[in-house]
């Protein structure tokens, strides 16, 4: 059990107060993390509280300002990037968000040697992406869907691509679906390790159907937003990968990297690019039916100035029980011989583990094993491999950092974090300097987050980077809910759950229950992390019990649980939430007449289906920006788990798994449906169709739309949303205002 105490430091309990909704909406109890911006093995940059950019040297213990807040303010910079040769800094301003990762900005180059901005050949605006080369101070940037190169910031640019066109051809940046569902980045270009070559993707969206929605704004007529967006079964983007020599870019121009024959024979995706050396690159490809992935290692042929990808350097990863990989296919981490690599994929027992591939995948050497999963490989050095897993004490919702000594035989394993701050810290990530000389650990909970700096050889803690002292003090007089993480064993399935209990919880009393669900494939909600959020308030102030349950389809507990939902979305995720609720009722402290469920996005889909399950368990529920039919969602995501919506594939389940098909079943529940009209991700269409089906079935329901808001419902909409949902739940549970 992980309990978060109420922290009663004062004998007079009346000095303690419950959380308020205002606390949550104001972000009163938000925490800070510290991720060093590493610039060498022993130096990092950090933006100070007063906005100076400060260089810290761990070994000398010295720090000094390299860029003043005055310079930052002179161009209203909100971000910066130091060139690897330390000559220049780019300053980023006029940030304008596009989709989840993408944004445009204005960039200024500041010369640190002279203490002034570079004049002449200034960068155009707005720029879609800009980055330094890994060595020196070359610049690559994307402007109006074309890629440009500068040898030095003051030089005129060299235009690499010319065919870029809004919503048609994207060079060096992903289109909507690649950004959201495949790359999870705003960029699609990659420098080779020493900056000799630049690789980039070209996405051709010419034939993709367009989603169009109104953006109301303030004008007399609304604008129409058009996004090439392939829904399940629709025409997909066509991707090509090119590499250009940045030293002599005009010599032969961009050279296309060949696609493996077994991939090119039908629709396919490019999934990632990893440079190995300046003249060796690794590309990963995926069939449209996403159970076959090919990793292809390609070499530069000096004589022909082309890239050669021999079949002997093709490694196939295939899943027979589900899709390839977890959420994404994992990426390789190459070792110093520049041909062998480490990679996470399923072992014979169906658990994701680290494997070492020297020649073929069939001959892979398994590095980790057990009924737990390796989650991320952080760094491979000559003698150590650092990774995270959920092995420790068999809690799948924890993350600890491990070091495997690969320089010695047999390799020895050490948990770096397991016993550091055991009660406070059970969920870590890490950030490594060059050669893993030093690293930062960022602990997310279950206690108050803390960031620390460590020696990469001894693992010794050097200093605390951020310990959230102010937050700790602010929470001293707050009655926080108690949290426990436990598991239910039901029909050979383990259902881990997190229960958030009111501060004065008494097992002999009855409490209203709210289920918070996400439940999407390869997600995890039950995590040992710190949070003071809306559900904390509902437990603290309103006396609700809140539960989160990880059912079938969720991650990091083996392929049996993960792939259980393959081709059957909307069935087992819902069943497992219902099963858990029945178990919670059996515990004796739940008022079974006051049970609600809510979720956002995939969670909105699951909560809607749970409400319409006909069990009579739920009195009410909320769906925020739900998917309502898998035919409405993005091809890359949907087809990964559902196959194609065609008669000879999986159309029947596409049709059976809609929320609309269950409209009649909403008659006996109170349903609140919420969506942003400018949702580029889960289109408003989804909720429009639910509403239409409910109206056609003459079923009463409540709804709220947020004009011109996207999938995140940010800004003032957030406050309105949570206030509205609070009123709805309090009314449902007969709680006084």
């Amino acid at each position: 059990i992980v309990l978060r105490p109420s922290r009663v430091h004062n004998s007079e309990e009346n000095t303690m107060r419950a959380l308020t909704l205002k606390d949550i909406l104001n972000g009163t109890f938000s925490y800070k993390t510290f991720f060093p911006n590493w610039i060498s093995g022993q130096e990092y940059l950090h933006q100070s509280a007063d906005n100076n950019i400060v260089l810290y040297n761990i070994e000398t213990g010295q720090s000094y300002t390299i860029l003043s807040n005055r310079t930052m303010k002179s161009v209203n910079a909100s971000n910066y990037g130091l060139s690897p040769d330390r000559q220049f800094v780019y300053l980023e301003s006029d940030y304008s968000k596009l989709w989840r990762y993408s944004y445009t900005a204005t960039y200024y180059i500041y010369d640190l040697s002279n203490g002034e901005f570079v004049r002449g050949n200034e960068l155009p605006r707005p720029i879609q992406y800009l980055c330094w080369s890994p060595v020196g101070s070359k610049l690559a940037y994307v402007y109006q869907n074309n890629i440009y190169l500068k040898q030095r910031p003051g030089d005129p640019p060299f235009q690499i691509t010319f065919n870029g066109r809004e919503n048609k051809i994207f060079n060096g940046i992903p289109d909507w679906v690649y950004e959201e569902e495949m790359l999870a980045t705003k960029y699609a270009l990659w420098w080779s390790p020493n900056g000799k070559f630049l690789a980039y993707a070209e996405f051709n969206d010419t034939d993709i159907p367009v989603i169009a929605y109104s953006y109301y704004g303030d004008e007399q007529y609304p604008r129409t937003i058009n996004i090439p967006y392939p829904k399940a079964g629709a025409k997909n983007p066509v991707v090509r990968i090119f590499i250009i020599d940045t030293t002599y870019p005009a010599y032969v121009g961009p050279q296309e990297v060949p696609v493996p024959a077994m991939i090119a024979s039908s629709d396919y995706y490019f999934s990632w690019l990893t440079w190995v050396t300046d003249e060796r690159v690794c590309l990963q490809w995926l069939k449209r039916v996403q159970n076959v992935s090919v990793l292809s290692i390609c070499d530069f042929r000096e004589d022909w100035q082309t890239w050669d990808c021999p079949k002997t350097q093709e490694h196939i990863e295939e899943s027979r029980t589900g899709w390839a990989g977890g959420f994404f296919v994992s990426t390789p981490v190459f070792s110093y011989d520049a041909i062998s690599y480490y990679k996470i994929f399923s072992d014979k027992d169906g658990y994701k583990h680290i494997h070492y591939i020297k020649d073929t995948v069939e001959n892979a050497i398994q590095i980790t094993s057990g009924k737990w999963e390796a989650i991320n490989i952080f760094r491979v050095t000559q003698d150590s491999l650092f990774y995270s897993s959920n092995e420790f004490e068999e809690y799948p919702g924890r993350r600890n950092i491990y070091r495997i000594s690969i320089g010695s035989y047999p390799p020895s394993k050490k948990c770096v974090t397991c016993h550091l701050r055991k009660e406070r810290c059970q969920y870590y990530t890490a950030s490594f300097s060059d050669y893993a000389k030093y690293y930062a650990l960022v602990c997310y909970g279950p206690g108050i987050p803390i960031s620390t700096l460590h020696d990469g050889r001894t693992d010794q803690e050097i200093k605390i980077l951020e310990e959230n002292k102010e937050l700790e003090n602010a929470l001293k007089n707050i009655q926080l809910p108690k949290e426990e993480i436990k598991k239910l064993e039901v029909d050979e399935i383990t259902l881990w759950y997190k229960m958030i209990l009111p501060p004065q919880f008494d097992r002999s009393k009855k409490y209203p229950l709210l289920i918070q669900v996400y439940g999407g494939p390869c997600s995890q909600s039950v995590r040992s992390v710190f949070a003071v959020n809306w559900i904390s308030y509902l437990a603290s102030k309103e006396g609700m019990v809140i539960a989160l349950v990880d059912g079938r389809g969720t991650a990091f507990q083996g392929d049996k649980l993960l792939y259980a939902v393959y081709r059957k979305l909307g069935v087992y995720e819902v069943e497992d939430q219902i099963t858990a609720v029945r178990k919670f009722i059996e515990m004796g402290f739940i008022d079974e007449k006051r049970i609600a469920i809510w979720g956002w996005s995939y969670g909105g889909y699951v909560s809607s289906l749970a409400l319409a399950s006909g069990t009579g368990l739920f009195k009410c529920g909320i769906a925020v920006a739900p998917v309502s039919s898998w035919e409405y969602y993005a091809s890359v995501y949907t087809e990964r788990f559902m196959g194609l919506p065609t008669k000879d594939d999986n159309l029947e389940h596409y049709k059976n798994s809609t929320v609309m098909a269950r409209a009649e079943y909403f008659r006996n529940v109170d349903y609140l449906l919420i969506h942003g009209t400018a949702d580029d991700n889960v289109h408003f269409q989804n909720s429009a169709q639910i509403a239409k089906a409910l109206v056609n079935a003459q079923v009463d329901f409540q709804a709220m739309w947020y004009s011109d808001q996207n999938h995140g419902l940010s800004g003032l909409s957030t406050n309105h949303l949570y206030t509205h949902m609070t009123h709805f739940l309090k009314q449902c549970f007969s709680l006084s205002d």
Epitope: S40, Q42, I66
Partner: nanobody, 116 residues
């Protein structure tokens, strides 16, 4: 405040060599990352070479393969060995932190003149 004293400049013929030194005082700790910079007449100051506290070096493209930066932590001194000098290397050479600190703290530099 750190004091920087550059020396070793002079007049040399094209193809010749020079070794510049930079004595760092006022700093008790080990040397931070240090760099050499230069300013030619009528031009802006530019970075030439850098060495970090782990002795990892980096060079501007126009001097790569000809110049070598090194350091002696015991003497708190940074060096720049300049070989195969060209007339375009003529400039006042400065040493400083790499990158320089704010506000900048430049020494008086040392003049290098390369005749053809």
């Amino acid at each position: 405040q750190v004091q920087l004293q550059e020396s070793g400049g002079g007049l040399v013929q094209a193809g010749g060599s020079l070794r510049l030194s930079c004595a760092v005082s006022g700093s008790t700790a080990r040397l931070d990352a240090m760099g050499w910079y230069r300013q030619a007449p009528g031009k802006q100051r530019e970075w030439v070479a850098g060495i970090d506290s782990a002795d990892i070096t980096d060079y501007a493209r126009f001097v790569k393969g000809r110049f070598t930066i090194s350091r002696d932590n015991a003497k708190n001194t940074v060096y720049l060995q300049m070989n195969s000098l060209k007339p375009e290397d003529t400039a006042v050479y400065y040493c400083n932190k790499w990158p320089p600190s704010v506000p900048p703290n430049w020494g008086q530099g040392t003049q290098v003149t390369v005749s053809s």
